[in-house]
Amino acid sequence: RKIPKVGHTFFQKPESCPPVPGGSMKLDIGIINENQRVSMSRNIESRSTSPWNYTVTWDPNRYPSEVVQAQCRNLGCINAQGKEDISMNSVPIQQETLVVRRKHQGCSVSFQLEKVLVTVGCTCVTPVIHHVQ
Amino acid sequence: RKIPKVGHTFFQKPESCPPVPGGSMKLDIGIINENQRVSMSRNIESRSTSPWNYTVTWDPNRYPSEVVQAQCRNLGCINAQGKEDISMNSVPIQQETLVVRRKHQGCSVSFQLEKVLVTVGCTCVTPVIHHVQ
């Protein structure tokens, strides 16, 4: 799903307050709900009728450094007999997510939010094809 | 997919540098790749064999303020005839994502990263059935 543009006032101080110096703001160290964990069914990427593989991308100057991308294995979907049926389509499910980008010059370290598009998995859809007049 | 613990040195300055004052760091305003957009197939939540609905949660002190959560509509999957087949299961696909939490007291505004679990959509899987002696 979409992340809205940051042009609104979320990162601004109230109008009655002095502006943020140097176009930066204070980010507290530590992550709220850091121990929260995904609790998905086991091996759904292999058991799905629209199975997918995972690719890990790694960037030491990004948090999280590891971002996992899914790729649908098939164009069609897998039927009950384990055969691919291309009258159905495996399609990716995407999600916009935030990561933190680290920028440093010597001892001066700053951070910036970055929007990343992650393919989380795949789902099987019926293509909407029909006759028209 | 999982976001690793932040206990590592990502937000720390190099050892040879003076420590970050007051447990906070500098976050530059603006978002990298802000215009990047999800390009998913149209209406996949309705056309999927494991369809889902969306619920929007809103929090003005969170960025993004709007977080969309998916809920699978059925326990089973929808077959070619549009009927639910309970020999297959609709299961949620989850993703850990980061949001920014705003904390303010008067003119003092600070921000903190927060981990949020988002259900992005659903996929149809073959249930794992174990035969026991």
Partner: antibody, heavy 124, light 106 residues
Framework: EVKLEESGGDLVKPGGSLRLSCVAS????????MSWVRQAPGKGLEWVGR??????????DYAAPVRGRFAISRDDSKATLFLQMNSLKTEDTAVYFC???????????????WGQGTVVVVSS | SYELTQPPSVSVSPGETARIPCSGE??????VYWYQQKPGQAPVLMIY???ERPSRISERFSGSNSGTMASLTISGVQAEDEADYYC?????????FGGGTKLTVL
């Protein structure tokens, strides 16, 4: 009524190029997979290639004998499928059919459509 | 790439049952489609997904796929069934046609 009308077939010399078109009507073209199939004189059907729909990213696949020489494309706004044929060989001589088959979500029936074919002759 | 093998010809008398085989090592993992083609005409889909029949096709036509062998069965064969028949598979790896079988109605 569904129609697939191929055009562009011609007599061409070996090494030459040709572009075939297939104009579709009567169904939602943009969401359908489209294929090219050919049939050499007195021979069987041979798959040439296909292009998938938007859902699957418009992926294009080719049969081994034409890979690297032929290129399939589509213009969904004009409901037209194309086959660009380069470096033509005598063995590419055939009737070229444009075809689609799909599950019609309104009628619940699996349907299949072929054009009348366009003749390509590669000869010196 | 894989191959689908069909006999060049099958002959049958009117009213009898004709069985046209199609063999291939990968058939246990593939859905099979069958086409009928008459001289000078475009092919017509007779069977899809191994054994499903489009609504406009006669119930005399049926399909099966077991092991490395698929087959098209035509019961109560009629003169108008004389044609070439092709098996086909279609999946992410591409499309393959069998060499075709000419059905002759004696």
């Amino acid at each position: 009524e569904v129609k697939l009308e191929e055009s562009g077939g011609d007599l061409v010399k070996p090494g030459g190029s040709l572009r075939l078109s297939c104009v579709a009507s009567g169904f939602t073209f943009g969401t359908a997979w489209m294929s090219w199939v050919r049939q050499a004189p007195g021979k069987g059907l041979e798959w040439v290639g296909r292009i998938s729909n938007k859902d699957t990213g418009g992926r294009i696949d080719y049969a081994a004998p034409v890979r690297g020489r032929f290129a399939i494309s589509r213009d969904d706004s004009k409901a037209t499928l194309f086959l660009q044929m380069n470096s033509l060989k005598t063995e590419d001589t055939a009737v070229y059919f444009c075809t689609t088959n799909f599950y019609d979500v309104l009628t619940g029936d699996h349907v299949d459509y072929w054009g009348q074919g366009t003749v390509v002759v590669v000869s010196s | 790439s894989y191959e689908l093998t069909q006999p060049p010809s099958v002959s049958v008398s009117p009213g009898e049952t004709a069985r046209i085989p199609c063999s291939g090592e990968t058939l246990p993992k593939k859905l099979v489609y069958w086409y009928q083609q008459k001289p000078g005409q475009a092919p017509v889909l007779m069977i899809y997904k191994d054994s499903e029949r489009p609504s406009r096709i006669s119930e005399r036509f049926s399909g099966s796929n077991s092991g490395t062998m698929a087959s098209l069965t035509i019961s109560g064969v009629q003169a108008e069934d004389e044609a070439d028949y092709y098996c086909q598979t279609s999946d992410s790896s591409g499309v393959v046609f069998g060499g075709g079988t000419k059905l002759t109605v004696l």
